[in-house]
């Protein structure tokens, strides 16, 4: 025997209170598949979330994050504050990367400059808060009298980062 509810299309629900008639989803609810016994409540994009796609009777709302925040999690279930390049997010807000560390993203944490000397190379371009050092040829490969532009970067061991 076929389930009478299976004929209820997306956007409706099988209303047990009305002899299993297919009733339209109430406002602010949806059903994305046929044969549903109830409609699901639409997601509300509030606070740091903003509406990317409005809810319809057949599909849920989609949210993203307001400017200055980035999405985390499935379907942008979380929003985390952005920082500038050269910074990392702490509980006290965005803090500059400590000397010897950098962050080239608006999210995430600072990490130490590459230690060129570990690969037998020299520093070609100094690191900054926003950029890693650029390693060049090994000191032995440089022409006589030439030297690297700076002393080797500190070892890639985390230093003390700001709280």
């Amino acid at each position: 025997l076929q389930d009478p509810c299976s004929k209820c299309p997306a956007g409706t629900f099988c209303d047990n209170n009305r002899n299993q008639i297919c009733s339209p989803c109430p406002p602010n609810s949806f059903s994305s598949t046929s044969g549903q016994k109830a409609c699901d409540i639409c997601r509300q994009c509030e606070g740091v979330f903003r509406t990317k796609k409005v809810c319809s009777s057949t599909s849920n709302a989609e949210c993203d994050c307001t400017p200055g925040f980035h999405c985390l999690g499935a379907g942008c279930s979380m929003c985390e504050q952005d920082c500038k390049q050269g910074q990392e997010l702490t509980k006290k807000g965005c803090k500059d990367c400590c000397f010897g560390t950098f962050n080239d993203q608006k999210r995430g944490i600072c990490r130490p400059w590459t230690n060129c000397s570990l690969d037998g190379k020299s520093v070609l371009v100094n690191g900054t808060k926003e950029r890693d050092v650029v390693c060049g040829p090994s000191p032995a490969d440089l022409s006589p009298g030439a030297s690297s532009v700076t002393p080797p970067a500190p070892a890639r061991e985390p230093g003390h980062s700001p709280q």
Partner: antibody
Framework: QVQLVQSGAEVKKPGESLKISCKGS????????ISWVRQMPGKGLEWMGK????????NYSPSFQGQVTISADKSISTAYLQWSSLKASDTAMYYC?????????WGQGTLVTVSS | DIELTQPPSVSVAPGQTARISCSGD??????AHWYQQKPGQAPVVVIY???NRPSGIPERFSGSNSGNTATLTISGTQAEDEADYYC???????????FGGGTKLTVL
């Protein structure tokens, strides 16, 4: 959609080596940290360490430093956890997770059994 | 490194409020996050950055964090909330993540 897919269960003998993997898809793998988390049978979660696949910078929990090696190959969007000599006490479920503080996506876990 | 201490178990009657604590030296100076893990499944974030609830997580879940204690509160606990709960924090001293020992929540 974002996914982290881990390699299958492993049964090993003490002293053997092992490398398990975690393949990311649906996002810019190079620019998000990947962490590894251990869960021994019936026990809690333990953070082992993390890697930034963009430049393979790693950072370990003091408890796991020198015990395991974390690596990544950004060209195939895959992170690895490896042991050079397994012990019976390494028997556990190992999860990879995206992030360093908030772990928003997790792999399905790789069960590693070490027994003679 | 900071150590996070949780009660091994908490029991609550359905519909009542469950509170799970997470103690650690000055944890209030760092963000605390909470994960729910059900048997055979990977953990899921239920609270992030002390008090924020991901979409899809019921409103009955809330969090707070100050001083030496972070707290996960589940108001009107339901049978489906029975799980293990873990607090965690990222510490900028040592650049490490630490998990609490976990709390098994039993709904009586």
């Amino acid at each position: 959609q974002v996914q982290l897919v881990q390699s299958g269960a492993e049964v090993k003998k003490p002293g053997e080596s092992l490398k398990i993997s975690c393949k990311g898809s649906g996002y810019s793998f190079s620019t998000y940290w990947i962490s590894w988390v251990r869960q021994m049978p019936g026990k809690g979660l333990e953070w082992m360490g993390k890697i930034y696949p963009g430049d393979s910078y790693t950072n370990y929990s003091p408890s796991f430093q020198g015990q395991v090696t974390i690596s990544a190959d950004k060209s195939i969007s895959t992170a690895y956890l490896q042991w050079s000599s397994l012990k019976a006490s390494d028997t556990a479920m190992y999860y990879c997770a995206r992030g360093y503080g908030i772990f928003d996506y997790w792999g399905q876990g790789t069960l590693v059994t070490v027994s003679s | 490194d900071i150590e996070l201490t949780q009660p091994p178990s908490v029991s609550v009657a359905p519909g009542q409020t469950a509170r799970i604590s997470c103690s650690g030296d000055n944890i209030g100076d760092q963000y605390a996050h909470w994960y729910q893990q059900k048997p055979g499944q990977a953990p899921v974030v239920v609270i992030y950055q002390d008090k924020n609830r991901p979409s899809g997580i019921p409103e009955r879940f809330s969090g707070s964090n100050s001083g030496n204690t972070a707290t996960l509160t589940i108001s009107g606990t339901q049978a489906e909330d029975e799980a293990d709960y873990y607090c965690s924090t990222y510490t900028f001293v040592g650049f490490t993540t630490v998990f609490g020992g976990g709390t098994k929540l039993t709904v009586l």
